[in-house]
């Protein structure tokens, strides 16, 4: 039978710098079992080198010198006795690029270089990025283990060094962030921030990194109510809002959370199963009425919990004044003033710009006040005739504003008659 030297190996292989590759390989050579059994030695050489003198890149012969630059990185993998010549290349370097040939030696008769089946190795720039693994979803306050690994990397060559960076890692000590694994307890403010794992071979210039954006689930921490872009002050889960009667009001309730909380508005202080008056974060009142005084609640419902804020709406109105109007009656000059306001206003009468307070000790005037519904009435009785032309004014005010009206009373009751003199506002 004709002796056969055969090698099955791929013609070319490409690997990224710093990564590993396994090149499958099998060979055959002529051998008879009745031969003596000297050891089988196999070698991988750089193309163009002379087997008798050159340093090998990989061998199973302990007596042959291996190139220092490939030592530990180029390794024979598999059982050569089973004619397996597979070559493992780790921590590939740019200078590894080139052709390699395989050689077999056994005793005096088998010495053969497979020059017709060369392996072409090309080392390219590293574009592979590490993978960051963790169990999703990340939940605020719940510790999570993260690991960083580079697909295609292996133990060969100098060790990999890791570094983690990101706002979420601020409290961690430097030692923790140099491991391939770390435990992170995310906070709400870490949502949307970047976390980067960088890998580097010790002593090499090759670095690669992967950045992920953290998706942190968190329940609402705060609720803010905005009135047309302005945040209302909130004290002990309650916000107070004075609104002018008749004014339009648009309130936006916002509770930052992830995923977004379901926001709804309720009238008053609702039970958990109450029906909302708005199923969005927006409460719109086209014309605020005094009947709406009281409360609204904004509730933020989230799988991780809920929050609610009570909005105490106080409806105010500027004083509206009717009067004064005056007429002569049996007991003297009778002037009336009607007014309406929220909160209830104070009222004073003036005679010639001088305030009339209470009832006069001399009995020259008397003030009476009463209220009916939203309106309050005050009357002034001036006893006796007028000695000169007089200006009578009434003024109503509350903390939001004031309004006054006046009437000019001409001397002599005949001039005034018994008619009503409308206020000159």
């Amino acid at each position: 039978e004709k002796p056969v030297y055969e090698l099955q190996v791929q013609k070319s292989v490409t690997v990224q710098e710093g990564l590993c590759v396994l090149v499958p390989c099998s060979f055959s050579y002529p051998w008879r079992s009745w031969y003596s059994s000297p050891p089988l030695y196999v070698y991988w050489f750089r193309d163009g080198e002379i087997p008798y003198y050159a340093e090998v890149v990989a061998t199973n012969n302990p007596d042959r010198r291996v190139k220092p630059e490939t030592q530990g990185r180029f390794r024979l993998l598999g059982d050569v006795q089973k004619k397996n010549c597979s070559l493992s290349i780790g921590d590939a370097r740019m200078e590894d690029t080139g052709s390699y040939f395989f050689r077999v030696e056994r005793g005096r008769d088998v010495k053969y270089s497979y020059q017709q089946n060369k392996l072409n190795l090309e080392v390219t720039a590293l574009i592979e990025k590490p993978d960051i693994h963790f169990l999703e979803p990340l939940e605020s306050g719940r510790p999570t283990r993260l690991s960083c690994s580079l697909p295609g990397s292996c133990e060969a060559g100098p060790p990999l060094t890791f570094s983690w960076t990101g706002n979420a890692l601020s409290p961690l000590d430097p030692e923790t962030t140099r491991s391939s694994e770390l435990t992170l307890t995310p906070r709400p403010e870490d949502h949307g921030t970047n976390l980067t794992c960088q890998m580097k071979r010790q002593g090499a210039q090759v670095t690669t990194e992967r950045t992920v954006q953290l998706n942190v689930s968190y329940a609402p921490q705060t609720i803010t109510i905005f009135r047309n872009g302005i945040a209302l002050e909130i004290l002990q889960n309650t916000s107070y809002l004075p609104v002018l009667e008749g004014q339009a009001l648009r309130l936006l309730c916002d509770a930052p959370s992830n995923p977004p909380a379901h926001l709804s508005w309720f009238q008053g202080s609702p039970a958990l199963n109450a029906t909302p008056i708005s199923n969005t974060g927006i409460l719109e009142l086209r014309r605020v009425r005094s009947a709406e005084e009281g409360g609204f609640t904004c509730r933020a419902q989230h799988p991780l919990g809920f929050l609610q804020i009570f909005l105490n709406l106080s409806v105010y109105s500027l004083p509206q004044l009717l009067g004064p109007s005056c007429s002569w009656e049996a007991e003297g000059l009778h002037c009336r003033c009607s007014f309406r306001a929220r909160p209830a206003p104070s009222l004073c009468w003036r005679l010639e710009e001088k305030p009339l307070e209470g009832n006069s000790s001399q009995g020259s005037f008397k003030v009476n006040s009463s209220s009916a519904g939203p309106w309050a009435n005050s009357s002034l009785i001036l006893h006796g005739g007028l000695s000169s032309d007089l200006k009578v004014s009434c003024k109503a005010w509350n903390i939001y504003g004031s309004q006054s009206g006046s009437v000019l009373l001409l001397q002599g009751r005949s001039n005034l008659g018994t008619g009503v003199v409308p206020a000159a506002l």
Epitope: Q221, T224, N228, G229, I230, A231, R250, L252
Partner: antibody, heavy 121, light 107 residues
Framework: QAYLQQSGAELVKPGASVKLSCKAS????????IHWVKQRSGQGLEWIGW????????KYNEKFKDKATLTADKSSSTVYMELSRLTSEDSAVYFC??????????????WGQGTLVTVSA | DVQMNQSPASLSASVGETVTITCRAS??????LAWYQQKQGKSPQLLVY???TLTDGVPSRFSGSGSGTQYSLKINTLQPEDFGSYYC?????????FGGGTKLEMK
Amino acid sequence: QAYLQQSGAELVKPGASVKLSCKASGYIFTEYTIHWVKQRSGQGLEWIGWFYPGSGSIKYNEKFKDKATLTADKSSSTVYMELSRLTSEDSAVYFCATHERAAQAAWSAYWGQGTLVTVSA
Amino acid sequence: DVQMNQSPASLSASVGETVTITCRASGNIHNYLAWYQQKQGKSPQLLVYNAKTLTDGVPSRFSGSGSGTQYSLKINTLQPEDFGSYYCQHFWSTPYTFGGGTKLEMK
């Protein structure tokens, strides 16, 4: 009185990102909403969105939702706006603005001096 | 979204004249309207808010009026420093859109 100091002019390449800052002083930073407004050369004003440092609430104009990202650093009383995937359409002056505390709505009473962003290859 | 339609886009006037700029909203904005003045190369300045309230320090020759969807800014007896661009902005609901602006130039 509120005072807003914006970062300096930026020249950036198409496709890149830029982060503008607006440093607030003269008031309690967490109590006021800060608005961002865009103005292209010789054009009108466009409202981008607001950031409320008190709770981290953000409201975007839908038009800018994928373009602008608003964040803040409470320790330095600074609000940031990051603009991503820049194109020539993003070349503009960007203003930050805030309001009076007692206002009924966020009328922009105080404005930063503006930051000019130029996107060019 | 509420759109703001501002007119005219440009306006030429002389010192001493009276001018009116209008803004029409696509929906009722309930007086939540502001007017700003902007000079070339400067930041806008708030003139009027709540549709008709003048900001402190703004001369009384400026006045705002309107309700519902129609609003206007009137400048009586124009002064040299009044020339520039004017913008309205609503604050009823987000987005808080601006009008297209009015460029007031000296005739």
